[in-house]
């Protein structure tokens, strides 16, 4: 829900001012204190799955 048109990075990535490029938010698990991780929103809840076929 960031303001529209403000983020040049695709969903799941965030802008690094230090590196001057978009970075994958998945890498924040390994390096959570990287500057771009601040812009990584919480992952949306997993879709509901039926427990029977």
């Amino acid at each position: 829900e960031q303001a529209p048109g403000t983020a040049p990075c695709s969903r799941g990535s965030s802008w690094s001012a230090d590196l001057d490029k978009c970075m994958d938010c998945a890498s924040c698990r390994a390096r959570p204190h990287s500057d771009f991780c601040l812009g990584c929103a919480a992952a949306p809840p997993a879709p509901f799955r039926l427990l029977w076929p």
């Epitope: 829900e1 960031q2 303001a3 403000t6 983020a7 040049p8 990075c9 965030s14 802008w15 001012a17 230090d18 001057d20 924040c28 698990r29 959570p32 204190h33 990287s34 500057d35 991780c37 601040l38 812009g39 990584c40 929103a41 919480a42 992952a43």
Partner: antibody, heavy 120, light 105 residues
């Protein structure tokens, strides 16, 4: 409407602890990073700490590192600042703020502020 | 971040030019300006060095790049007399300038 409501300030002795809370409403809390900023009496703004939307990434000013802990409870839409080993120089009005943090950075919504006084 | 001047004494209707200088080059996208009036919370004016925040009048404008940034108030209104702060994000920390007080001459 978009709102941040703070609680938890007060008078505490040097070496003591205090926890500040910031309740968010009117926006999708998990989509935004959050931050704490403080302002000592008659002084300028000083950034204290920030946390990502997921809560997995935290950042601290050198002046509070190891003493303060930022956290968030996303289901409760609440931000916290646990302050330990408080010093006289921590006396300030503490603000929570919503952070626009993806390419553009800025704090676009602020809480009303809460005064923390550290004195014996 | 170093802001200058510390105090600016001007009259309503005059133009105000506030400076914010970083010790090294910073990304323009991370530079913001805030206004704070006595007893009030700070208010975001400008983000991305030059984009006005929601509801900010067009007399406020931001410019600059590299290490030098400027906030300009084209014609001061009585409600514009306040303290202004610049802020930058980089190296995993947010930094505020010391502030510029714009007072009535």
């Amino acid at each position: 409407q978009v709102q941040l409501v703070q609680s938890g300030g007060g008078l505490v002795k040097p070496g003591g602890s205090l926890r500040l809370s910031c309740a968010a409403s009117g926006f999708t809390f998990t989509s935004y990073a959050m931050s704490w900023v403080r302002q000592a009496p008659g002084k300028g703004l000083e950034w204290v700490s920030a946390i990502s939307g997921s809560g997995g990434s935290t950042y601290y000013a050198d002046s509070v590192k190891g003493r303060f802990t930022i956290s968030r409870d996303n289901p409760k839409n609440t931000l916290y600042l646990q302050m330990n080993s408080l010093r006289a120089e921590d006396t300030a009005v503490y603000y929570c703020a919503r952070v626009r943090a993806n390419y553009y950075y800025g704090m676009d919504v602020w809480g009303q502020g809460t005064l923390v006084t550290v004195s014996s | 971040l170093t802001q200058s001047p510390g105090t600016l004494s001007l009259s309503p209707g005059e133009r105000a030019t506030l400076s914010c200088r970083a010790s090294q080059s910073v990304s323009s996208s991370t530079l913001a300006w805030y206004q704070q009036k006595p007893g009030q919370t700070p208010r975001l004016l400008i983000y991305g060095a030059s984009s006005r925040a929601t509801g900010i009048p067009d007399r406020f404008s931001g410019s600059g790049s590299g290490a030098d940034f400027t906030l300009t108030i084209s014609r001061l209104e009585p409600e514009d007399f306040a303290v202004y702060y610049c802020q930058q994000y980089g190296s995993s920390r947010l930094t505020f300038g010391g502030g510029t007080k714009v007072e009535i001459k």
